[in-house]
């Protein structure tokens, strides 16, 4: 099933997030992703766990998954590079870089997003945008068009409370509020954007969605700048 869900959000303005990617398996949306360079999309490592023999592709320039749009184009994947320390049973190091078969054709609806290189936490209370094509309610309705939600960043101490994520949130992870509005495992790999800068990637660990005591977990890209640079080089 698609790993994707924006709960309690609303439809995004069409093509206002030109960095947004749909990672697809056998022609169906699987995960979110974010264009970070002309030929590279950043996503979550767990997204490809079940991909095995399937065909992985990346859709760029899309708002609707099904409708024809002039900016839409599906790219084959030349190389998939999961973070070397990612493991199936943990949310740590949940990053994946996908090299497209060719450089993306850039334009108003397809453009890489600057990503944070300064390794410091986003200040709690900052409102950040998360977007995706995942299911939009607990009944499992899947949207055709891109959804988004603006969520406040939560401080790590709160997120690590015993009643919340009980110490699982390392310095390489960050949290955002999940009170009825949330990202969920289906939006894995999608971007958390704060003030026009990519700060986090939705992790794909399984957790309850929309419960304020189980905040959304995001991998901090700044903490992986050296790895990202080394792969893109």
């Amino acid at each position: 099933p698609p790993r994707g869900r924006i709960l309690g959000g609303r439809e995004a303005e069409a093509h206002a997030r030109p960095y947004m990617a749909s990672v697809q398996l056998n022609g169906a949306h699987l995960c979110g992703g974010v264009l970070v360079a002309e030929q590279w999309v950043l996503s979550a490592a767990h997204c490809l766990e079940d991909a095995a023999d399937g065909k992985v592709q990346v859709l760029l320039g899309a708002h609707s998954l099904s409708q024809p749009e002039p900016s839409k184009r599906l790219y084959d994947v030349l190389r998939a590079v999961p973070h070397p320390d990612s493991q199936p049973d943990t949310i740590d190091h949940d990053l994946l870089l996908l090299q497209l078969s060719e450089k993306a054709t850039l334009g108003p609806a397809v453009r890489p997003l600057p990503w944070q290189r300064v390794d410091r936490d986003v200040a709690p209370g900052t409102l950040c945008d998360v977007a995706g094509w995942g299911i939009v309610n607990h009944a499992g309705r899947r949207p055709d068009s891109l959804q988004h939600v603006l969520l406040p960043v939560l401080d790590r101490a709160t997120c690590n409370r015993r009643t919340h994520h009980d110490g699982a949130i390392t310095e390489r992870l960050m949290c955002a509020e999940s009170n009825r509005r949330d990202s969920c495992k289906g939006d894995s790999g999608g971007p958390l954007v704060c003030g026009g800068v990519l700060e986090g990637v939705v992790t794909s660990g399984s957790r309850v969605c929309g419960n304020r005591k189980k905040p959304g977990i995001y991998t901090r890209v700044a903490s992986y700048a050296a790895w990202i640079d080394s792969v893109l080089a």
Epitope: V122, A123, P124, G125, T126, A131, H148, L150, E177, V193
Partner: antibody, heavy 122, light 107 residues
Framework: QVQLQQSGPELVKPGASVKISCKAS????????INWVKQRPGQGLEWIGW????????YYNEKFKGKATLTVDKSSSTAYMLLSSLPSEDSAVYFC???????????????WGQGTSVTVSS | DIQMTQSPASLSVSVGETVTITCRAS??????LAWYQQKQGKSPQLLVY???NLADGVPSRFSGSGSGTQYSLKINSLQSEDFGSYYC?????????FGGGTKLEIK
């Protein structure tokens, strides 16, 4: 068109509480954060906190925790701010303001209420 | 908390002149900055968002610029309706503090 209509001026005694309102119209109330801002006479602007009407989530300036309580009534598209244990220095104009969204992740206070004057005096 | 230092605190200028108001953040705010105009006895009005973008209906004589910690609002060819107070506000973290304001007066 978008409008935020605030309740009228209040004269309250020191130590008392006051609840002021901000009625929204012209947009989907539950989709936008509502902020509250304080302005003392002849002074600058001070952010108190926000509430997201869709979920009731709140976030406060540390300085106003315990002083201000933000709530909403979705059925009437109205946001409220309760100010408690008022000393004279809480005499000010209080504004509500909506966060508008721009692009993917920028925001700013795009619509403001006309302000509610609160005077604390015995 | 991030501090926003706005200067000058007041400015006396004539109609037709050009003025620049500056705002310095105590740390990088990544262009997460807005400018507002407030007339006496009225509520503030949004002029600029994301440091450089004019809000709907704002005349083109207004312009915002800057990045990192340094930002400015420029008003070309001042009109009589431009007099009042101006405030910057950051949105990088909480609380989203305002600058102290700049009072623009007619000379």
């Amino acid at each position: 068109q978008v409008q935020l209509q605030q309740s009228g001026p209040e004269l309250v005694k020191p130590g008392a509480s006051v609840k002021i309102s901000c009625k929204a119209s012209g947009y989907t109330f539950t989709d936008y954060y509502i902020n509250w801002v304080k302005q003392r006479p002849g002074q600058g602007l001070e952010w108190i906190g926000w509430i997201f009407p869709g979920s009731g989530s709140t976030y406060y300036n540390e300085k106003f925790k315990g002083k201000a309580t933000l709530t909403v009534d979705k059925s009437s598209s109205t946001a409220y701010m309760l100010l408690s244990s008022l000393p004279s220095e809480d005499s000010a104009v209080y504004f509500c303001a909506r966060y508008g969204y721009y692009g993917s992740s920028f925001y700013a206070m795009d619509y403001w209420g006309q302000g509610t004057s609160v005077t604390v005096s015995s | 908390d991030i501090q926003m230092t706005q200067s000058p605190a007041s400015l006396s200028v004539s109609v037709g002149e050009t003025v620049t108001i500056t705002c310095r953040a105590s740390e990088n705010i990544y262009s997460n900055l807005a400018w507002y105009q407030q007339k006496q006895g009225k509520s503030p009005q949004l002029l600029v968002y994301a440091a450089t973008n004019l809000a709907d209906g704002v005349p083109s004589r207004f312009s915002g610029s800057g990045s990192g910690t340094q930002y400015s609002l420029k008003i070309n060819s001042l009109q009589s309706e431009d007099f009042g107070s101006y405030y910057c506000q950051h949105f990088w973290g909480s609380p989203p503090t305002f600058g102290g304001g700049t009072k623009l007066e007619i000379k």
